[in-house]
Amino acid sequence: KEEQISFRDCAEVFKSGHTTNGIYTLTFPNSTEEIKAYCDMEAGGGGWTIIQRREDGSVDFQRTWKEYKVGFGNPSGEYWLGNEFVSQLTNQQRYVLKIHLKDWEGNEAYSLYEHFYLSSEELNYRIHLKGLTGTAGKISSISQPGNDFSTKDGDNDKCICKCSQMLTGGWWFDACGPSNLNGMYYPQRQNTNKFNGIKWYYWKGSGYSLKATTMMIRPADF
């Protein structure tokens, strides 16, 4: 019987000859557990595993710790891949993180971190980032050093408030910090002066809620 090939990430999918954008089944490192992810095989050389996407407000991102852990939404549209998978994956080898952003005026920008990983659940999926380049601000809109992940039922931020309740969505909040790509989705002409929107401060400022965001990862040695 032929052994079924399993892929840890979209880079492995790409290298196996699958070079079309789409949903692929990935396998947790050192496990048989599977997860469906969207693979971008075109942008910047391909092989990108999409870990977050916002584009139309069709999915509620005000979710529980468990939902952010295992993932939610639809990989073909708005979704969160899952903190546990991303944590395990990014602790296996060095990954880069690219965050692609679109505003409502037709502009696009990105932030690229040359090293990205998430701590384990025991350490609240704390984000670790190094080496920022890109067009979405010279200062990182994800606070450095990285913060623990927080959700509406898992308050790990530094704020006296509960950032996830104030700003909505799960994120690596500080107090509450310069970004939240999992905030409320506001349509065009309702997207300004919103403290709880989809924010990337060092590109668009504090009250601007973005039109679309994508967070994607790929091995650094791809």
Epitope: S143, I160, L167, A175, C176, P178
Partner: antibody, heavy 120, light 108 residues
Framework: EVQLVESGGGLVQPGGSLRLSCAAS????????IHWVRQAPGKGLEWVAG????????YYADSVKGRFTISADTSKNTAYLQMNSLRAEDTAVYYC?????????????WGQGTLVTVSS | DIQMTQSPSSLSASVGDRVTITCRAS???????VAWYQQKPGKAPKLLIY???SLYSGVPSRFSGSGSGTDFTLTISSLQPEDFATYYC?????????FGQGTKVEIK
Amino acid sequence: EVQLVESGGGLVQPGGSLRLSCAASGFTIMDYWIHWVRQAPGKGLEWVAGWTPAGGYTYYADSVKGRFTISADTSKNTAYLQMNSLRAEDTAVYYCARFVFFLPYAMDYWGQGTLVTVSS
Amino acid sequence: DIQMTQSPSSLSASVGDRVTITCRASQFLSSFGVAWYQQKPGKAPKLLIYGASSLYSGVPSRFSGSGSGTDFTLTISSLQPEDFATYYCQQGLLSPLTFGQGTKVEIK
């Protein structure tokens, strides 16, 4: 009508204790945070301590940590500030304030203040 | 601790003047956590602005707030006699909560 009324201030010797009360009316303290803020004569505002109803979390300024205790009796709709080991530098008008923990995320109502004088 | 550095510490102005007070935080603050208060001698402070730029109920529209990140501003567009007072910025996000040192607005 929302009201906060402080009481319990007065003259006390260094090392002594006082208990300030903040009686709330027109709202229930279970729905708000309560903070104590003080103002030394001729000086600016200094936050002292805060109490949150969810889990009864308490927060303190470093200058009073270990000496002051903030608490609340929700059945009496009253917050308290127990002040021990008082020092001359604790001399101030003490205000209690209601803090809204959504919007406006700020101290929207204040009491009239009660004067605490620490002197021998 | 977050320092809230206010400037100027005092200013003299005339009725009708436009007055601007600035407050710089020592680290990035979400704007919803920044407030401005007015205090007159012998009285408790009063909330003017919350969320850095939102006018509190009952406060005259000549008061406005702006800013984000680390730099915040209170503006009085046309100073009135009753506006002579001391103004404080405050952050309510991190413990300890901190106030600016105050700006005393005096009559020229």
